[in-house]
């Protein structure tokens, strides 16, 4: 560092800023002599509002720094970004954000739940706000699927009026024909591929509608949509295998005790989806008067043994093997429960007693030509064989 | 030496977004000091809109913070503009400067012209 | 902060000393930068920290001031120098003055 050149005065001795180190220290700062900064842990380099990595300044031939010394400035991670379904709350101290400040996230209670951390996060060296696993980013308020106003899935019969909050998760999708979906998390609807195949190339033209039970009301949530993701296994006019479609939403819907997402099956689901166990679909498609429904109508059926249920479409006019390991039955044999055309894509549900949610088992599908035909049948799509496939457009979209 | 360079489409619909882009080279923007987007409206009137550091941490000015996002890509050294729900009182020349408050020099971008207009 | 630069052009003559002038709405000790623009050209730095000049420019500007008041002198005007001049304060976020032009008398 020393360079002696007599000729030259020595700079000024620099005084370290409060919470800084200089070094090398020196007797004294001749000519190219340099000293850096060095700030204590939650501590940073700024020269006003501008932030430094490193700080070096050079003694000059007139006996002055080629630079003015810099602020050890105590890390300020800022205001913590809004958690969009949540809030944050200051444990340090109102609006305090500096180094080693502790925040608090939650999410709205009742209708979303945190996922990723605990929602604590500290203001590190570094500048961000970490959480104790190491996140940077925020955790994410998750809804709470599956919940109902209804409590038990009832005793079987024909349609009923559903009422308010009973099938929040039940989706209008308008746009070429009338069908449904379910809603699930904040921004996709599954659905039947059947319902959505001419639009697949032109998701926008779905006119998507939810939080509302009269079909033709003016009060609903609208929804828009984003992409139509239809099963690569599915063949339009060859069968109904691999009936299923998921539309990402081109925003996140708002959840409340009118919108709420439908669960997907755990594991364990198969235990509640046994044959005779009862399974609820919920649409405004045709009733037995032959016109669509008005008001959202529910049907409490039994699941149907699938070897009496391929058998039921073994005879003509359906080909053999119409019925796949892909779907399941659900119906009365002596008929006069089922769903029906506009119905399409809805959810089959069931309620899983150990979390006490409901959960969509199936996707309606198909069935005879004559809805609650006795001896038929109406299909389903079964979801359970297909959440990697969910789970995975979920995740890359 | 160093350079900045910025790019993006020269005219946007109000209430879109407007996303610029600024390419840097000849220094890595995580080796040091705060990477800015600076506005000048007709008439000269310069405004900052904020800067991303070298660490990746962002300020930004306190009348654009609801509308404005500055993020970058390190393994293409380059940072980017968003600016939501713009009006045509968003039509500017953008630069992109590296400030440093006399901590090495300053370098700017040669701006770029974006209009606002339906 | 508001950064003031109440004299919206200045005339001045080749060889003339002209000083510009900044008055910040807080104080905002030594961190103010000057630059110099000219037509269809993005801002050059001179002047960081109120007083210290960059590299490479010459030595007829100088920078003074701290606090509130801060000055910008050009002794011996050259024709190159006839531009626009901003100040600009990074004390506290970062906000510019309205800027000066310099023209010939």
């Known amino acids: 560092h020393h360079h002696h050149h007599h000729a030259s005065q020595p700079c000024p001795y620099p005084m370290a800023p409060p919470n800084g180190h200089v070094s090398p220290v020196q007797a004294k700062y001749i000519l190219k002599d340099s000293f850096s900064i060095f700030c204590e842990t939650g501590y940073e380099l700024l020269q006003g509002h501008l932030p430094l990595k490193s700080f070096t300044a050079v003694c000059q031939k007139d006996g002055s720094w080629d630079r003015p010394m810099p602020a050890c400035s105590i890390v300020d991670c800022g205001p913590p970004d809004d958690l969009p379904s949540g809030r944050v709350e200051y444990i340090t101290g109102p609006g305090v954000t500096t180094y080693k400040a502790v925040i608090q996230y939650s999410c709205e209670e009742t209708f979303y739940t945190m996922k990723v951390n605990d929602g604590k996060y500290v203001c590190e060296a570094d500048g961000f706000w970490t959480s104790s696993k190491g996140e940077k980013s925020l955790p994410v308020c998750e809804p709470v699927c599956g919940l109902s106003a209804r409590t038990t899935g009832g005793r079987i019969y024909g349609g009923q009026k559903a009422k308010p909050g009973d099938f929040p998760w039940q989706v209008l999708i308008l746009g070429g024909t009338t069908a449904a979906g379910a809603l699930l998390y904040d921004n996709w609807v599954l659905t039947a591929a059947h319902a959505v195949y001419e639009q697949k190339h032109d998701a926008s033209a779905l006119d998507i509608r939810m939080g509302t039970l009269k079909r033709l009301s003016p009060h609903y949530t609208q929804a828009w949509s984003e992409a139509v993701f239809i099963h690569e296994g599915y063949t339009h006019d060859a069968g109904f295998d691999n009936d299923i479609a998921l539309i990402k939403l081109n925003n996140k819907v708002v959840i409340n005790s009118n919108i709420t997402p439908i669960c997907l099956p755990r594991k364990e689901a198969e235990s509640f989806m046994r044959t005779d166990d009862i399974g609820t679909a919920s649409g405004w498609g045709l009733t037995q008067r032959g016109f669509l429904a008005r008001n959202l109508m529910y049907v409490d059926i039994p699941i149907v043994d699938h070897q009496k249920c391929t058998a039921a479409y073994e005879k003509p006019p359906y080909p053999r093997g119409s019925v796949t390991a892909n779907m399941l039955c659900a119906g009365l044999e002596s008929g006069g429960k089922d769903s029906c055309r506009g119905d399409a894509g809805g959810a089959l549900v069931f309620l899983d007693s150990e979390t006490e949610r409901w959960f969509v088992g199936g996707i309606v599908s198909w069935g005879s030509m004559n809805c609650g035909e006795a001896g038929q049948y109406g299909v389903y799509t079964k979801v359970i064989n297909y959440i990697p496939w969910i789970e995975n457009i979920i995740s890359d979209f | 030496d160093v350079q900045l360079q910025e790019s993006g489409p020269g005219l946007v619909k109000p209430s879109q977004s407007l996303s610029l882009t600024c390419t840097v080279t000849?220094?890595?923007?995580?080796?040091?000091?705060?990477w800015n987007w600076i506005r000048q409206f007709p008439g000269n009137k310069l405004e900052w809109m904020g800067y991303?550091?070298?660490?990746?941490?962002?300020s930004y000015n306190p009348s654009l913070k609801s509308r404005i996002s500055i993020t970058r890509d390190t393994s293409k050294n380059q940072f980017f503009l968003q600016l939501n729900s713009v009006t045509t009182e968003d039509t500017a020349t953008y630069y992109c400067?590296?400030?440093?408050?006399?901590?090495?020099?300053?370098?700017w971008g040669q701006g770029t012209s974006v209009t606002v207009s339906s | 902060i508001v950064m003031t630069q109440s004299q919206k052009f200045m005339s001045t003559s080749v060889g003339d000393r002209v000083s510009v002038t900044c008055k910040a709405s807080?104080?905002?000790?030594?961190?103010v930068a000057w630059y110099q623009q000219k037509p269809g050209q993005s801002p050059k730095a001179l002047i960081y920290?109120?007083?210290y000049r960059y590299s490479g420019v010459p030595d007829r500007f100088t920078g003074s001031g701290s606090g509130t008041d801060f000055t910008l002198t050009i002794s011996n005007v050259q024709s190159e120098d006839l531009a626009e001049y901003f100040c600009l304060q990074y004390n506290s976020y970062l906000t510019f003055g309205s800027g000066t032009k310099l023209e010939l008398k």
């Open positions: 920290s109120a007083s």
């Open positions: 991303i550091s070298y660490s990746g941490r962002t």
């Open positions: 000849g220094y890595s923007i995580t080796s040091d000091y705060a």
């Open positions: 400067a590296k400030l440093g408050g006399g901590h090495g020099m300053d370098y």
């Open positions: 807080q104080n905002v000790d030594t961190n």
